[in-house]
């Protein structure tokens, strides 16, 4: 099927993502019209080859002109009309630089396939991204339910042909000692000598019968176990490492992992077959016991039966003993597996084996580091112990689901201090937050003469001593959990493993789906790619470092792309969440491609991205505007940080924002919100209403107050070219003009420092007189 | 659940002799033969109990009917010698999973559960 004929089909949030990909440069019209010539064609050769680029433009023009042949014949005047637009809009952008276009299409059709990959991965995971606990069941599931019940029956069956062989070896051992008591076997002189031959027959017959039955019986178990153990492969293998795989990536923001539930009642089913069929196996050494005879086998194949069970039972339940909860601190509930010292962590363990007669058995005991005592020290790792209460009982009362678990919620770490300032040795070749750790869960349990050590442990966290490594501490789970789904590699930033674009992109992108209503879009995902590759044009496969990622910084910054990144994620989850959620900020665009869909709007329009420049975070907007002589300009102003925004929400700077023209008059740059919203449509829900803005005026007083309110403004001066972005200043109340020993309190950053006459050229924000 | 497969019904003269065989399932402690003749009460024939290996008739057929077991095949036989017009009838297979199968059995009024098969037809021509 033809990729745009198979993106047609797509979810609709798959469609919105489809949507935002297409803009006035490539129009969704034109990738309809033609959408299967447009497929064949080689895109990405035509952006790297000037002489195929202008073939193929040549070439597209021609199949515009083909297609309106068709439209006309349909007599489709609106599709006509779209197509003529469309085609003078083409030659008079990309005549004279067809690789653009091509460029343009190639990462369109790269980003549609992404997409789809996108689709069928979350339709392979029972669409959890949705609902994360629905009960999809996939064919694969299917056929494992299939083979559970199969296994049941089999039990059962088994349980049956034991009571026959039961029966059958009580006549044949009753028959046999009458006839012994009788004398009959050694009197065979006597007159009932046919008689007792008869029954001799008889009793042979019944032991080959026996023989028989206990053979199919033997056999039967082995076929049966055989069977149970390709299905705990399959739960073990398959159905639960799929699931901590989610759970990693659930880890990191990724689709919400499904619930244990459905895998908890297929491993206790097996565990429960599994018991009765060791019960079987034990009656058979009962039924040997009672009658024996030369090749019975019982005695041949019984011990070696009852270790193959009870070694599948054991590991069945060593599988079973999982992390339910990744450590995380409750106060930083969307970053798990980092933990700060002193601070406490909660974290919890399930049994998927849910026997009643277990509650309360099981003791916990937390630890950890507890297999790396002397790598450690060798590595130079800092050693911890575990504060608080570290052995809990599981029970099924305390979950909703009863399920068997163990909810540590008291748990704190403390840095075992030693001479080196808490290292163990000076040659610690990874800093700490590089540094991996594991969290260990031991129990034992005994169950039916079974004596088990279970032991689980979280996935890796990273320690960290003080709020201000959070971020790079994040990288290194967001980097180990992409890349790796072993689940106790700590030595894995010793040689970190490169990732390719689509991973980190998917991962970004979870950065904010994850705290947002809103992950990237791809047209902000290859902004971000190409701050972290250059420009290019198919970013899929391109490989990234951990250095690249987290440590270096980026060309001709001070800072690393991660925590340039991670600083605007906090701003947008803190200060501009409700404009991010409904989709205003623009955010990840490049120069090029604001000036470009800026360029072709009214003045008046404007557009919200992050600044490249600022290492804390922070946010801009940018407008075009005509100049004098009619000429269209792009400007921007300085960016906001979380200091500034700390004063004053961003939707009212935006509302509130205005340049000082040359004559002294105030005008409000921001009009329309690209492509065309009213700017109060979009940011008068988000400002306070004046009403509420002074609701303590002295009633009793003669005059009411004068209201005042802050706007930012920048005064326009011959120095702004479209290269400077222009600095908001704040514009102090007329009343207190010239007057610097009254007015706003200077903050940290000199965000409210009154305005003087001559105006000095900080970044400031101004209260004014309605 | 027991099955069991009868075969071996079919015309004989009167005086003359036939084989019955059924086979089941699986083991069970208790075989036996069962008749009804139309518009008669089904009746005990002969059983056979896997202790003991003692045969229950009754009275009509004693003398002249044999019944065997073969504990390999799980089968058992109804060797019919000098039939009788009144030996005419739909012969059923039967089987316990207890072992007493003796007259009470044949009677019917012996407890637990007895599984039948589909039954094979005598005739019997003078």
């Known amino acids: 099927m033809a990729q745009w004929n198979q993106l047609q089909q797509l979810d609709t949030r798959y469609l919105e993502q489809l949507h935002q990909l297409y803009s006035d440069s490539f129009p969704m019209e034109l990738r309809q019209f033609l959408a299967p010539w447009i497929e064949s064609q080689d895109w990405a050769y035509a952006a790297s080859k000037e002489s195929h680029a202008t073939l193929v433009f040549h070439n597209l023009l021609g199949e515009i002109d083909q297609q309106y042949s068709r439209f006309l014949q349909e007599s489709n005047v609106l599709y006509q009309h779209n197509l003529r637009r469309i085609k003078q809009f083409l030659q008079s952008r990309y005549l004279e630089k067809p690789m653009e276009i091509a460029r343009i299409v190639a990462r369109c059709l790269w980003e549609e396939s992404r997409l789809l990959q996108t689709a069928a991965t979350a339709a392979q995971q029972g669409g959890q991204a949705n609902h994360p606990t629905a009960a999809v069941v996939t064919e694969k599931q299917q056929m494992l339910e299939q083979h559970l019940q199969d296994v049941r029956k089999r039990v059962q069956d088994l349980e049956q042909k034991m009571k026959v062989v039961e029966n059958l070896q009580d006549d044949f051992d009753f028959n046999y000692k009458t006839l012994k008591s009788q004398g009959d076997m050694q009197d065979l002189n006597g007159n009932n000598q046919s008689v007792t031959r008869q029954k001799m027959q008889q009793l042979e017959q019944m032991l080959t019968a026996l023989d028989q039955m206990r053979r199919s019986i033997v056999s039967e178990l082995a076929g049966l176990l055989s069977a149970m153990e390709y299905v705990q492969k399959t739960l073990t293998d398959e159905e639960l490492a799929d699931w901590k795989r989610r759970q990693q990536i659930a880890c990191i923001g990724g689709p919400p992992n499904i619930c244990l539930d459905r895998l908890e009642n297929w491993i206790t089913s097996l565990a429960e077959s599994q018991l009765q069929t060791r019960q079987q196996i034990k009656k058979l050494e009962e039924l040997q016991q009672k009658v024996s005879y030369k090749g019975d086998p019982i005695v041949q194949h019984r011990p070696m039966l009852e270790e193959r069970i009870v070694e599948l039972f054991r590991n069945l339940m060593k599988s079973a003993f999982v992390v339910e909860r990744q450590p995380c601190m409750p106060m930083h509930p969307d970053r798990p597996l980092v933990i700060k010292t002193g601070v406490q962590f909660t974290t919890k363990v399930r049994l998927l084996v849910k026997f009643p007669e277990l509650n309360y058995q099981l003791k916990i005991k937390v630890c950890i580091d507890k297999d790396s005592g002397d790598v450690a020290a060798l590595r130079g790792s800092r050693k911890f112990n575990i504060l608080g209460t570290n052995t809990k009982v599981m029970n099924m009362e305390e979950s909703n689901n009863g399920s068997l678990s163990a909810e540590f919620k008291h748990l704190t770490l403390r840095e075992q201090r030693c001479g080196n300032g808490g290292r163990a040795n000076c040659d610690a070749s990874l800093i700490v937050t590089e540094e991996l750790h594991l969290i260990t869960f031991e129990t034992e349990v005994y169950h039916q003469g079974l004596k088990i050590d279970l032991e689980t442990h979280s996935l890796p966290v990273v320690v960290i001593s003080n709020i201000c490594q959070m971020p790079n501490a994040w990288a290194s789970i967001l980097w180990y959990n992409m890349l790796t789904n072993n689940p106790k590699n700590v030595n894995f930033f010793t040689k970190p493993p490169i990732g390719t674009w689509d991973q980190v992109a998917e991962v970004l992108s979870w950065q904010f789906s994850s705290t947002t209503k809103r992950g990237l879009s791809i047209e902000q995902l290859t902004t971000l790619a190409e701050k972290l590759l250059g420009p290019g044009v198919n970013y899929s496969g391109c490989q990234i470092t951990w250095a690249k990622f987290c440590k270096e910084n980026m060309a001709g910054k001070g800072f690393s792309f991660w925590v340039w990144l991670d600083n605007i994620i906090d701003l947008v989850k803190k200060y501009i969440l409700a404009l991010w959620n409904e989709g205003y900020i623009m955010g990840f665009i490049s120069k090029e491609r604001e000036r470009a869909i800026l360029s072709t709007k009214p003045p008046g329009t404007f557009l919200l991205r992050f600044s490249e420049s600022s290492k804390e975070g922070g946010v801009t907007f940018t407008w075009v505007e005509k100049d004098i002589s009619g000429k269209t300009q792009i400007q921007s102003v300085e960016p906001y940080t979380k200091q500034q925004l700390n004063n004053m929400s961003f939707a009212e700077i935006i509302m509130g924002y205005k340049i000082m023209d040359a004559t002294n008059i105030l005008v409000s740059p921001l009009v329309y919100l690209y492509p065309d919203i009213p700017k109060e449509e979009a940011f008068g829900k988000y400002c306070r209403p004046e009403s509420q803005e002074h609701p303590e005026a002295d009633p009793g007083s003669a005059a009411p107050y004068l209201k005042t309110k802050f706007i930012c403004v920048t005064p326009t001066t011959c120095s702004n070219t479209i290269d400077l972005p222009m600095s908001p200043r704040t514009l102090d109340s007329l009343m207190q003009f010239g007057n610097n020993g009254e007015g706003a309190e200077p903050s940290a950053g000199g965000q409210f420092e009154s305005l003087t006459f001559d105006m000095e050229l900080t970044s400031e924000c101004a209260t004014s007189p309605m | 659940d027991v099955q069991l497969v009868e075969s071996g019904g079919g015309s004989v003269q009167a005086g003359g002799s036939l084989r019955l065989s059924c086979v089941a399932s699986t083991y069970t402690g208790c075989m036996g033969w069962f008749r009804q003749a139309p518009g008669k009460e089904r009746e005990g024939v002969a059983a056979l109990s896997s202790r003991g290996f003692a045969g229950h008739y009754t009275d009509s057929v004693k003398g002249r009917f044999s019944i065997s077991r073969d504990y390999v095949k799980n089968a058992v036989y109804l060797q019919m010698n000098t039939v009788k017009p009144e030996d005419a009838a739909m012969y059923y297979c039967?089987?316990?999973?207890?072992?007493?199968?003796?007259?009470?059995?044949?009677?019917?009024?012996?407890?637990?559960?007895?599984?039948w098969g589909q039954g094979t037809q005598v005739t019997v021509s003078s």
């Open positions: 039967a089987a316990r999973e207890g072992w007493e199968c003796g007259e009470t059995w044949l009677d019917r009024t012996a407890g637990g559960h007895t599984y």
